[in-house]
Amino acid sequence: SGRGEAETRECIYYNANWELERTNQSGLERCEGEQDKRLHCYASWRNSSGTIELVKKGCWLDDFNCYDRQECVATEENPQVYFCCCEGNFCNERFTHLPEAGGPEVTYEPPPTAPT
């Protein structure tokens, strides 16, 4: 696309509410976009007393808040639902909370895939 940013064509997909919403629970999502618009991946999660509950992952539309972010980093201090977005294929596999006000960085790794 000539602007130097990482192109996003596929993201990790996840929906914790998949049964009610009748979607897939997890997988890969191919991102479809309009010409001249950037695409991103996102992750959203809750943190209940240190226990991470993944909410959703997938593709995200052109959003200046996500530009040139190779890693998915949430910066809000203590939201009900954390959100991060990034550019580059599958960049939402790992996600991090790094509050702007300072404090410890917490990175969440996906669980290892069981061998088939």
């Epitope: 919403e21 009748r22 991102c31 809750r46 909410v55 959703k56 997938g58 539309l61 939201p79 639902v81």
Partner: antibody
Framework: EVQLLESGGGLVQPGGSLRLYCAAS????????MSWVRQAPGKGLEWVSA????????YYADSVKGRFTISRDNSKNTLYLQMNSLRAEDTAVYYC????????????WGQGTLVTVSS | DIQMTQSPSSLSASVGDRVTITCRAS??????LNWYQQKPGKAPKLLIY???VLQSGVPSRFSGSGSGTDFTLTISSLQPEDFATYYC?????????FGGGTKVEIK
């Protein structure tokens, strides 16, 4: 230019059926999820139903579940809403709208078609 | 379902005024919040998505902010063409819900 054109609205008696159509042009129809949203006279917007780009996944508001069926024909660039067991409270302007990738917003809307349920 | 509550339901303002509309979700919806404008007899038009991202062609006097459950649409200097009804909508759940709308009228 993206265009969505609804048709099929009209006057129907309570308990009757109606099929709405939304003809799409100006974009790759099968790449987009599509929704129906309605607006009763003088009231706000109410989301009714949605369907994935492939047509495999469908979603319904509780108020229409079991009575309305959303479907699409990507070869004809057309979205449908089959409405059965219609009630007076279904009277509204029905809009079709496109959605790129959930959780994207509804970025283009048709001009709407009026459905009136009355005896 | 996620309930969306908008306030006020209507307001009167003059050209040049700063106008603020609020939207509250019944549960945390992160950044999955969109705003629409509707004029009488017309289809809704997308203004803002992802809380704060202006849709192409929308004037910069419109802005959005907030997170979690509380969100705001601001018009920094109201123009004659801005008199309309504004709706918030959540896309956190595939079962979309809209706020009840805020009608912006001429004072």
């Amino acid at each position: 230019e993206v265009q969505l054109l609804e048709s099929g609205g009209g006057l129907v008696q309570p308990g009757g059926s109606l099929r709405l159509y939304c003809a799409a042009s100006g974009f790759t129809f099968g790449a987009y999820a599509m929704s129906w949203v309605r607006q009763a006279p003088g009231k706000g917007l109410e989301w009714v139903s949605a369907i994935s780009g492939s047509g495999d996944d469908t979603y319904y508001a509780d108020s229409v579940k079991g009575r309305f069926t959303i479907s699409r024909d990507n070869s004809k660039n057309t979205l449908y809403l089959q409405m059965n067991s219609l009630r007076a409270e279904d009277t509204a302007v029905y809009y079709c709208a496109r959605q790129l990738i959930p959780p994207a917003p509804l970025d283009y809307w048709g001009q709407g078609t009026l459905v009136t349920v009355s005896s | 379902d996620i309930q969306m509550t908008q306030s006020p339901s209507s307001l009167s303002a003059s050209v040049g005024d700063r106008v603020t509309i609020t939207c509250r979700a019944s549960q945390g919806i992160s950044r999955f919040l969109n705003w629409y404008q509707q004029k009488p007899g017309k289809a809704p038009k997308l203004l803002i998505y992802g809380v704060s991202v202006l849709q192409s062609g929308v004037p910069s006097r419109f802005s959005g902010s907030g997170s979690g459950t509380d969100f705001t649409l601001t018009i920094s200097s109201l123009q004659p063409e801005d008199f309309a009804t504004y709706y918030c909508q959540q896309s956190f759940s595939s079962l979309f819900t809209f706020g009840g709308g805020t009608k912006v009228e001429i004072k």
